[in-house]
Amino acid sequence: QAGPLPKPTLWAEPGSVISWGNSVTIWCQGTLEAREYRLDKEESPAPWDRQNPLEPKNKARFSIPSMTEDYAGRYRCYYRSPVGWSQPSDPLELVMTGAYSKPTLSALPSPLVTSGKSVTLLCQSRSPMDTFLLIKERAAHPLLHLRSEHGAQQHQAEFPMSPVTSVHGGTYRCFSSHGFSHYLLSHPSDPLELIVSGSLEDPRPSPTRSVSTAAGPEDQPLMPTGSVPHSGLRRHWE
């Protein structure tokens, strides 16, 4: 007896983080034997959508012409072949930006920092939010979360970095999010350029958790140290 059908591959184009009002296409790729594709969205009646396969039948397209809050969430897809339904795909998390006004990102004491010293990136929102995310441009795994505990909302989150090395240099943005849905993010903050001086042959800071050895310097998540600020926010690594 044949084993279970292989799970399909699920992805989004142009990406899984989409600004409000922009279009996005979700693709589900199975096998050439697929007769039908089904897309399920978490916490929505299943199936969320069904599509016939596109020739040569190994994938289907699910189109979202204009991104809104309703489309943000966690998706899985399946395909049906003559022998039945496949295993579910790995989940796709479709995130919408533009749900809230942009926060303000600043560096303390300054965005010009000497290698080996400390700097804190401060993401501030004029209204209370419960999650703050720090993004580094061109990093493969750029998300650093600070989420408030017990639903207590905060106006800011601090992202301390120490000791700073050349790897920390670059362009950062932050986002904020409300408890309504963690798939809904604010507009991005204006960019902040962190400039690290005197950084020849800096040693890398030792990571606070193991990271794949295949990752290059720009693929490493940020490694701030020190305690989480008194704001009641808890650190989460993505």
Partner: antibody
Framework: EVQLVESGGGLVQPGGSLRLSCAAS?????????ISWVRQAPGKGLEWIGS?????????YYATWVKGRFTISRDNSKNTLYLQMNSLRAEDTAVYYC???????????WGQGTLVTVSS | DIQMTQSPSTLSASVGDRVTITCRAS??????LAWYQQKPGKAPKLLIY???TLASGVPSRFSGSGSGTEFTLTISSLQPDDFATYYC????????????FGGGTKVEIK
């Protein structure tokens, strides 16, 4: 020209309702701003009524004294903000302003104001 | 709640005087404080934001200082056009606020 223009003020009887409009031009209400309604009773200071976030969710916050009598909404297609006022009282007589919160968290753009008079 | 307390409520001064207005927040607002000038029958005009940054087109005789809970607006040499009412405002928006403005300071001719 970047501006906010209020309209809809006038004379209303106690207990009545009124809807004020705030039309934005030169910028989009759906871009990254908060917009607030602020009022000023004759001879008195500025009083914050509430604010709406221009993000797609449109979060609103109100001053504690509002207690559900006023509602802020918006119509992005018309680039217009609204203040619905119910159960009006004589003490609601004031000039009503809409104002935009800039990136600096300050109110960097104000409308000219519209006068609401609550009297029998 | 964050309460903004302005003092004095009225200030009598002459042209050329140095004038200082104080705004006190009931809890830290960091540097998220703005100052406005308002003349009778007109909308308020932004003078200073983030406690000490001069808004575009505002004369350099106006300056702001402070952080946390204590802030001041200073007019180094009062001009005839400066007789007006001044308000401070904190930048936070949330549902537990009575007001975001101070009570105002009227600067009048002595």
């Amino acid at each position: 020209e970047v501006q906010l223009v209020e309209s809809g003020g006038g004379l209303v009887q106690p207990g009545g309702s009124l809807r004020l409009s705030c039309a934005a031009s030169g910028f989009s209400l759906s871009s990254s701003y908060w917009i607030s309604w602020v009022r000023q009773a004759p001879g008195k200071g500025l009083e914050w009524i509430g604010s709406i976030d221009s993000g797609s969710v449109g979060i609103t916050y109100y001053a504690t004294w509002v207690k559900g009598r006023f509602t802020i909404s918006r119509d992005n297609s018309k680039n217009t903000l609204y203040l619905q006022m119910n159960s009006l009282r004589a003490e609601d007589t004031a000039v009503y302003y809409c104002a935009r919160h800039g990136d600096n968290w300050a109110l960097d753009l104000w409308g000219q104001g519209t006068l609401v008079t609550v009297s029998s | 709640d964050i309460q903004m307390t302005q003092s004095p409520s009225t200030l009598s001064a002459s042209v050329g005087d140095r004038v200082t207005i104080t705004c006190r927040a009931s809890q830290s607002i960091q540097s998220w404080l703005a100052w406005y000038q308002q003349k009778p029958g007109k909308a308020p005009k932004l003078l200073i934001y983030k406690a000490s940054t001069l808004a575009s087109g505002v004369p350099s005789r106006f300056s702001g200082s402070g952080s946390g809970t204590e802030f001041t607006l200073t007019i180094s040499s009062l001009q005839p056009d400066d007789f007006a009412t001044y308000y401070c405002q904190h930048g936070y928006i949330r549902g537990d606020l009575d007001n975001v403005f101070g009570g105002g300071t009227k600067v009048e001719i002595k």
